[in-house]
């Protein structure tokens, strides 16, 4: 704590050539009495930019009316910025002395640089799709910005992510810089409609950050769940068996019916229904002529989704005298046998 502090809230200000730079400065007290002066650089060779007390500074204007009663805002604007204006600017409070004013307190300084905006962030996801519960990496890149200070945030559906690593290159002084960030995202079954956003905030963007997006629909694979159900009989010797393929993404899916291990029919998912979460449902049915079988029949619904190894669900029909309506097979895992007797 000090009796007077000179506050320069901006560590750096970036201005395009030809624009006007605003260098902010406030004092926490007006006591002791004395003028504010602005300098570029520090030490004995510093350059006077503005003196509240006296002088003519054609390129400099004050943000506030310094004659206004009890004004404590000593911010200035410097017009028509050129690269030669780059440097660190100090707002310095002087106190009246005898005979000359004495430097009393200096602000921390504001670095003025000629500015360069970052390029639009480009977000890339993994080369291969991944399933829910898996962690995938996204990268975000942006280039060509100056100064080096930059803030990068990751969001998933508006929620800020915390598991990411960011590098700004080069480490030393440079005309411009690049940022590279890798974020880890855990997929859930509801992520088909999700977006991952990389947000880059930089002084040149005037509070309006640049965003790059990636749709998790390009990354996620939600494997289907299968349910094989025996439907009411259509005729004395026919049984209708359906295979419900639920909650899968993407749509690319091929279904094969096997009777006792032999391919009966293969079809590709076409008229699918879309769920609210973006996944799909599809149903295939098979009409089995029981009279054509002397032995028990094992029906298998085999699904190949998005080029992945096939998953299947089986249903056993026992060939007997009089078929009647059967219940549902509710087993949830990929393979398994559920007997349904036909009397």
């Amino acid at each position: 704590e000090e009796e007077l502090q000179v506050i320069q809230p901006d560590k750096s200000v970036l201005v395009a050539a030809g624009e006007t730079a605003t260098l902010r400065c406030t004092a926490t007290s007006l006591i002791p009495v004395g003028p504010i002066q602005w300098f570029r650089g520090a030490g004995p060779g510093r350059e006077l930019i503005y003196n509240q007390k006296e002088g003519h500074f054609p390129r400099v204007t004050t943000v506030s009316d310094l004659t206004k009663r009890n004004n404590m805002d000593f911010s200035i604007r410097i017009g028509n910025i050129t690269p030669a204006d780059a440097g660190t600017y100090y707002c310095v409070k002087f106190r009246k002395g005898s005979p000359d004013d004495v430097e009393f307190k200096s602000g921390a300084g504001t670095e003025l640089s000629v500015r360069a905006k970052p390029s639009a962030p480009v977000v890339s996801g993994p080369a291969a799709r991944a399933t829910p519960q898996h962690t995938v990496s996204f990268t975000c890149e942006s280039h060509g910005f100056s100064p080096r200070d930059i803030t990068l945030k990751w969001f998933k559906n508006g929620n800020e992510l915390s598991d990411f690593q960011t590098n700004v290159d080069p480490v030393g002084e440079s005309v411009s810089y690049s940022i590279h960030s890798t974020a880890k995202v855990v997929l859930t079954r509801e992520d088909v409609h999700s977006q991952v956003i990389c947000e880059v905030a930089h002084v040149t963007l005037q509070g309006d950050p640049l965003r790059g997006t990636a749709n998790l629909s390009e990354t996620i694979r939600v494997p289907p769940t299968l349910e094989v159900t025996q439907q009411p009989v259509r005729a004395e010797n026919q049984v209708n068996v359906t295979c419900q393929v639920r909650k899968f993404y993407p749509q690319r899916l091929q279904l094969t019916w096997l009777e006792n291990g032999n391919v009966s029919r293969t079809e590709t998912a076409s008229t699918v229904t879309e769920n609210k979460d973006g996944t799909y449902n599809w149903m295939s049915w098979l009409l089995v002529n029981v009279s054509a079988h002397r032995d028990d029949v094992k029906l298998t619904c085999q699904v190949e989704h998005d080029g992945q190894p096939a998953v299947s669900k089986s249903h056993d029909l026992k060939v007997s005298a009089h078929p009647k309506e059967q219940g549902s097979n509710t087993a949830a895992e990929n393979t398994g046998s559920n007997e349904r007797n036909i009397y």
Partner: antibody, heavy 114, light 111 residues
């Protein structure tokens, strides 16, 4: 909280040097200046001088030739020395914080008498 | 030196009434858009207590009954309404020019 406490001999002989100490707490002597002010019995206030946070000093021109204000930041103490005192220097001596004089000590009475 | 002349030297006020003290400087105490004039209250046996800084700004913890105004060379401290414990000496002080100076004081008595 902010506190200032003056101390020193209550009686000083004419022509000698008056030496007072102001011990402060609750703030840093590198961040704040400290004033010395005096008040003769039944009279008004007179500013003696100030030592700023950076150690520089400003004095009342009427007393400048006789006054020295110094400090020991590590001990949180500010010192006043007034040389060649006369009866006219009899007063209550106060120390007060900063150019704004927002906190004052209780004062210490100094009598100049033989 | 800037001489500060306070008037009146003393005044007696009834509780609930307004007390007005003026301070005239021998030269302007304004600099850089501010008036470097301050007011203090001193009760017997106590150090001065800051009331108003920079002519019109109330110090923290000081009742709003106290107010200050003025610029340049003419300044006013107003107490409205006066209360019994406002009986004290009141001083103006400038720190616009060295040496910093105080007014001669105004004694406020309560009727």
């Amino acid at each position: 909280q902010v506190q200032l406490q003056e101390s020193g001999p209550g009686l000083v002989k004419p022509s000698q040097t008056l030496s007072l100490t102001c011990t402060v707490s609750g703030f840093s002597l590198t961040g704040y200046g400290v004033n010395w002010i005096r008040q003769p019995p039944g009279k008004g206030l007179e500013w003696i001088g100030i030592i700023w946070g950076d150690g520089s000093t400003d004095y009342n021109s009427a007393l400048k030739s006789r006054v020295t204000i110094s400090k020991d930041t590590s001990k949180n103490q500010v010192f006043l020395k007034l040389s060649s005192v006369t009866a006219a220097d009899t007063a209550v001596y106060y120390c007060a914080r900063a150019g704004k004089m927002d906190y004052w000590g209780q004062g210490t009475t100094v009598t100049v008498s033989s | 030196d800037i001489v500060l002349t306070q008037s009146p030297a003393s005044l007696a006020v009834s509780p609930g009434q307004r007390a007005t003290i003026t301070c005239r400087a021998s030269e302007s105490v304004d600099s850089y858009g501010s008036s470097f004039m301050h007011w203090y209250q001193q009760k017997p046996g106590q150090p001065p207590k800051p009331l108003i800084y920079l002519a019109s700004n109330l110090e923290s913890g000081v009742p709003a009954r106290f107010s200050g105004s003025g610029s340049g060379t003419d300044f006013t401290l107003t107490i409205n309404p006066v209360e019994a414990n406002d009986a004290a000496n009141y001083y103006c002080q400038q720190n616009n020019e060295y040496p910093w100076t105080f007014g001669g004081g105004t004694k406020v008595e309560i009727k």
